[in-house]
Interface confidence: medium
C-alpha cells in the first residue's frame, strides 16, 4: 500500500502512546549519551508534526520518508559534534547513506553506569508521574541496548509498570520490588541478546541466514503447520526483524502487529498452543506468541528417509528448486527434533546440502547419498558430549568455580582479547550451568547451545569494534552456525607473548569490602585474567593457591578496623606472594 504520508500512516496504525514510545526508543538507540529531557523534546516535536500530517497529509514535509524526518531531527541537534564526534559526519550524507551511517555508529558497549534500583526513590517517581516513569524506562534500556527489539521493549515497559503498581502499595517496598526487578532484568538482558543475534545474522550473514534460523525454530515450535505456512511466517518475520535491526521501528512494530493478527486468525492451521495468546492485548499477544510452548508432533509422520534418501527423485527435486527442497528438508528435520539446538539443525542441513551437491553430480547418486543420515550422528554427539562434560564440571565446582574454569579456558585460547570482555563473556558462558544443566535430558542440548550462541555473539560484536585476535575474527565471521564448535575447538595460543607484570593491576582498596557479591567476583575474576595474561602457563594448582590467598587477604582486610590501612600494608605483601607462587 502507498500512503501520501508515511508518518501519518504509522501514527494512525500505532496510536499515539505506542508511536511516542517507539520514537523515544529510536532516538535513544541512536543518541545514547543524550539526557532523557533532550529526547522527550525531540519526541514531542515529532509527535506534533505527525499529528499535523494526520490532519492534512498534503501538509509541508509530510510526504518525506521517516528516515529523512528522523535524520533531519538528529542533525539539527546543535551539540551533535561536541557529544558524538564523527556521528555528525553522517549529516553530510544523503539518504539512504545517512541512515546507514547512523546505524554504524550505534555503540554496543556504551559507557553508561549500571542501573542500581532504589525502591523508595523509584516508587516516588512512579507515583509522581507514571508517563515519565514509563518513558524513562524505555530510554534507559534503549540507550544501553541499541538493538533492543523495540515492540518487545514496549511490552517489558508494561510489565515494569505493573511491578511498581503492585509493589509501591506494599508495606515492604524493597522486599516486593527487588526480586521482581531482578527477574525482569534477566528476561530483558536475554531478550537484548536474542535480538542482537538476530540483527547480527541479518547484517553479517544476510537475510537467507536469518530465514533458515527462523524456519528451523518455527518448525520445532509449530510442527503441525505445513511447510508453506511456516514459510509464510518466516518471510513476514524476516521483514519485521530487518526493519527493527535497520532502525525502522515504526514500520517494524506495525508489521509485527499484522503478523500477530495473521497468526491468530490462522491458529487452527498453525498451533494448538496459541489460544491463550490470542485473547491478550496486542503487546502481550505478540510476546506470548514468540514464547509459545511447542505444539505436539502430528502422529502420522513418515520417516524422513522416505523423501530425502529413499525417494529415487531426490536429485531431480533438489535440482528443480534447491532452496525449496532444502527448506522442506530443514522443516521436516526440525519439526521431528525439538530436542536439537537451531545451530545443530542448520549444521545438519548444511551436510545434507553438501552431500547432494556432491552425489547428484555422480553416476549413481542414490548409492552415494544412501548413508547421508549416518553423517549427522557425529554432529549430534559433539555438542552432547561437550554439554555432558561441562555440566559435570559445573556440578563439581558450582557457578563461581565453573565461571573461573571458563575464564582460564578462554583466556588461554584468546589472551589478546580485552580483560573486561573476557570476564564478561566467561561469566555469561558460566551461567549456562545453572540455566541448562538442571533441565531434563531432552531440553539440555537446545538450551545450552542456543544460549551459548547468544553469548558468543556478544563476544563477536565486542571484538568487531576493536579486533585484536585473528582466531576470534575467524570463528565469528566464517560461519554463523559453526561459531560455537569453532570456539570450542580453539586450543591455547602458544604464539602469545605474556604481558609484563603490572603491580597496579593487583592493587585493591577498601571499596572492595562494600561491593555486592557479583561485583566482588568480577574484581577477583579480572585479577585472574590479568594473572593468566602474565603467566599463560600457570598450573591449575598455582591458580587455585593464588585465588585462595586472595580470598584470605580480602577477608582479613575487610575484617580489620581500618580497611584502607590494611589494604595499603597487606596489598604489596600479596603481590610478592603472587610472584613467588608463579615464579
Amino acid at each position: 500500500d502507498t500512503y501520501k504520508s508515511e508518518i501519518a500512516h504509522r501514527f494512525k496504525d500505532l496510536g499515539e502512546q505506542y508511536f511516542k514510545g517507539l520514537v523515544l526508543i529510536a532516538f535513544s538507540q541512536h543518541l545514547q549519551q543524550c539526557p532523557y529531557e533532550e529526547h522527550v523534546k525531540l519526541v514531542r516535536e515529532v509527535t506534533e508534526f505527525a499529528k499535523t500530517c494526520v490532519a492534512d497529509e498534503s501538509a509541508e514535509n509530510c510526504d518525506k520518508s521517516i528516515h529523512t524526518l528522523f535524520g533531519d531531527k538528529l542533525c539539527a541537534i546543535p551539540s551533535l559534534r561536541e557529544h558524538y564526534g564523527d556521528l555528525a559526519d553522517c549529516c553530510e550524507k544523503e539518504e539512504p547513506e545517512r541512515n546507514e551511517c547512523f546505524l554504524q555508529h550505534k555503540n554496543d558497549n556504551p559507557d553508561i553506569p549500571k542501573l542500581k534500583p532504589d525502591p523508595v526513590a523509584l516508587c516516588a517517581d512512579f507515583q509522581e508521574d507514571e508517563q515519565k516513569f514509563w518513558g524513562k524506562y524505555l530510554y534507559e534500556i534503549a540507550r544501553r541496548h541499541p538493538y533492543f527489539y523495540a515492540p518487545e521493549l514496549l511490552y517489558y515497559a508494561i510489565i515494569y509498570k505493573d511491578v511498581f503498581s503492585e509493589c509501591c502499595q506494599a508495606a515492604d517496598k524493597a522486599a516486593c520490588l527487588l526480586p521482581k526487578i531482578e527477574h525482569l532484568r534477566e528476561k530483558v538482558l536475554t531478550s537484548a541478546a536474542k535480538q542482537r543475534l538476530k540483527c547480527a545474522s541479518i547484517q553479517k550473514f544476510g537475510e537467507r541466514a536469518f530465514k533458515a534460523w527462523s524456519l528451523a525454530r518455527l518448525s520445532q515450535r509449530f510442527p503441525k503447520a505445513d511447510f508453506t505456512e511456516i514459510s509464510k511466517i518466516v518471510t513476514d518475520l524476516a521483514k519485521v526483524h530487518k526493519e527493527c535491526c535497520h532502525g525502522d521501528l515504526l514500520e517494524c512494530a506495525d508489521d509485527r502487529a499484522d503478523l500477530a493478527k495473521y497468526i491468530c486468525e490462522n491458529q487452527d492451521t498453525i498451533s494448538t498452543k496459541l489460544k491463550e495468546c490470542c485473547d491478550k492485548p496486542l503487546l502481550e499477544k505478540s510476546h506470548c506468541i514468540a514464547e509459545a510452548k511447542r505444539d505436539e508432533l502430528p502422529a502420522d509422520l513418515n520417516p524422513l528417509e522416505h523423501d530425502f534418501v529413499e525417494d529415487k527423485e531426490v536429485c531431480k527435486n533438489y535440482k528443480e528448486a534447491k532452496h525449496v527442497f532444502l527448506g522442506t528438508f530443514l522443516y521436516e528435520y526440525s519439526r521431528r527434533h525439538p530436542d536439537y539446538s537451531v545451530s545443530l539443525l542448520l549444521r545438519i542441513a548444511k551436510i545434507y546440502e553438501a552431500t547432494l551437491e556432491d552425489c547428484c553430480a555422480k553416476e549413481d547418486p542414490p548409492a552415494c547419498y544412501a548413508t547421508v543420515f549416518d553423517k549427522f550422528q557425529p554432529l549430534v554427539d559433539e555438542p552432547k558430549n561437550l554439554i555432558k562434560q561441562n555440566c559435570e564440571l559445573f556440578e563439581k565446582l558450582g557457578e563461581y568455580g565453573f565461571q573461573n574454569a571458563l575464564i582460564v579456558r578462554y583466556t588461554k585460547k584468546v589472551p589478546q582479547v580485552s580483560t573486561p570482555t573476557l570476564v564478561e563473556v566467561a561469566r555469561k558462558l558460566g551461567l549456562v550451568g545453572s540455566r541448562c544443566c538442571k533441565r531434563p535430558e531432552e531440553e539440555r542440548l537446545s538450551c545450552a547451545e542456543d544460549y551459548l550462541s547468544l553469548v558468543l555473539n556478544r563476544l563477536c560484536v565486542l571484538h568487531e569494534k576493536t579486533p585484536v585476535s585473528e582466531k576470534v575474527t575467524k570463528c565469528c565471521t566464517e560461519s554463523l552456525v559453526n561459531r560455537r564448535p569453532c570456539f570450542s575447538a580453539l586450543t591455547p595460543d602458544e604464539t602469545y607473548k605474556p604481558k609484563e607484570f603490572v603491580e597496579g593491576t593487583f592493587t585493591f582498596h577498601a571499596d572492595l569490602c562494600t561491593l555486592p557479591e557479583d561485583e566482588k567476583q568480577i574484581k577477583k575474576q579480572t585479577a585472574l585474567v590479568e594473572l593468566l595474561k602474565h603467566k599463560p602457563h600457570a598450573t591449575e594448582e598455582q591458580l587455585r593457591t593464588v585465588l585462595g590467598n586472595f580470598a584470605a587477604f580480602v577477608q582479613k582486610c575487610c575484617a580489620a578496623p581500618d580497611h584502607e590501612a590494611c589494604f595499603a600494608v597487606e596489598g604489596p605483601k600479596f603481590v610478592i606472594e603472587i610472584r613467588g607462587i608463579l615464579a
Epitope: 505456512e229 509464510k232 490462522n266 502430528p298 509422520l301 523423501d307 527435486n317 525449496v324 522442506t328 521436516e332
Partner: nanobody, 119 residues
Framework: EVQLLESGGGLVQPGGSLRLSCAAS????????MLWVRQAPGKGLEWVSV????????YYADSVKGRFTISRDNSKNTLYLQMNSLRAEDTAVYYC????????????WGQGTLVTVSS
C-alpha cells in the same frame, strides 16, 4: 469432492505469453496452499511453483524463476500462472494441485491444460 479445473493452455510462439487459470471447488480454497506442476511429453512430473494461502510467499522452480508468476484470487477460488518469455522446453501439460500438509508432494490435481511452445 475436490475438483480442480485448469484452462488457458494453447499453442504459442517462443518468447510469447500465456495465462493459465485453475478453478477450485470442494475444499476451503482460502486456507490451502496451491501449486502448479507440469509434465513434458515422455517425462516425469516437474514442480513449477507454490503459493501460500494468503498470496505470499511464492516459490518457483529455478527453470521458470523470473519468467513465471503464480497468483490467486481467493474471492473467486481461482489460481493463476502468468507465463512470459516462453521457451520450447516449457511445452508440457500443466496441472494445478492442492499442496499437502507436509512434503513437497501434492494431494489432488486436475486434468491439466496443454501448453505448446513452437514456431
Amino acid at each position: 469432492e475436490v475438483q480442480l479445473l485448469e484452462s488457458g493452455g494453447g499453442l504459442v510462439q517462443p518468447g510469447g505469453s500465456l495465462r493459465l487459470s485453475c478453478a477450485a471447488s470442494g475444499f476451503t480454497f482460502d486456507t490451502s496452499s496451491m501449486l502448479w506442476v507440469r509434465q513434458a511429453p515422455g517425462k516425469g512430473l516437474e514442480w513449477v511453483s507454490v503459493i501460500h494461502q494468503s498470496g505470499t510467499p511464492t516459490y518457483y522452480a529455478d527453470s521458470v524463476k523470473g519468467r513465471f508468476t503464480i497468483s490467486r484470487d481467493n474471492s473467486k477460488n481461482t489460481l493463476y500462472l502468468q507465463m512470459n518469455s516462453l521457451r520450447a522446453e516449457d511445452t508440457a501439460v500443466y496441472y494445478c494441485a492442492k499442496f499437502p500438509s507436509s512434503r513437497m508432494k501434492f494431494d489432488y490435481w486436475g486434468q491439466g491444460t496443454l501448453v505448446t511452445v513452437s514456431s
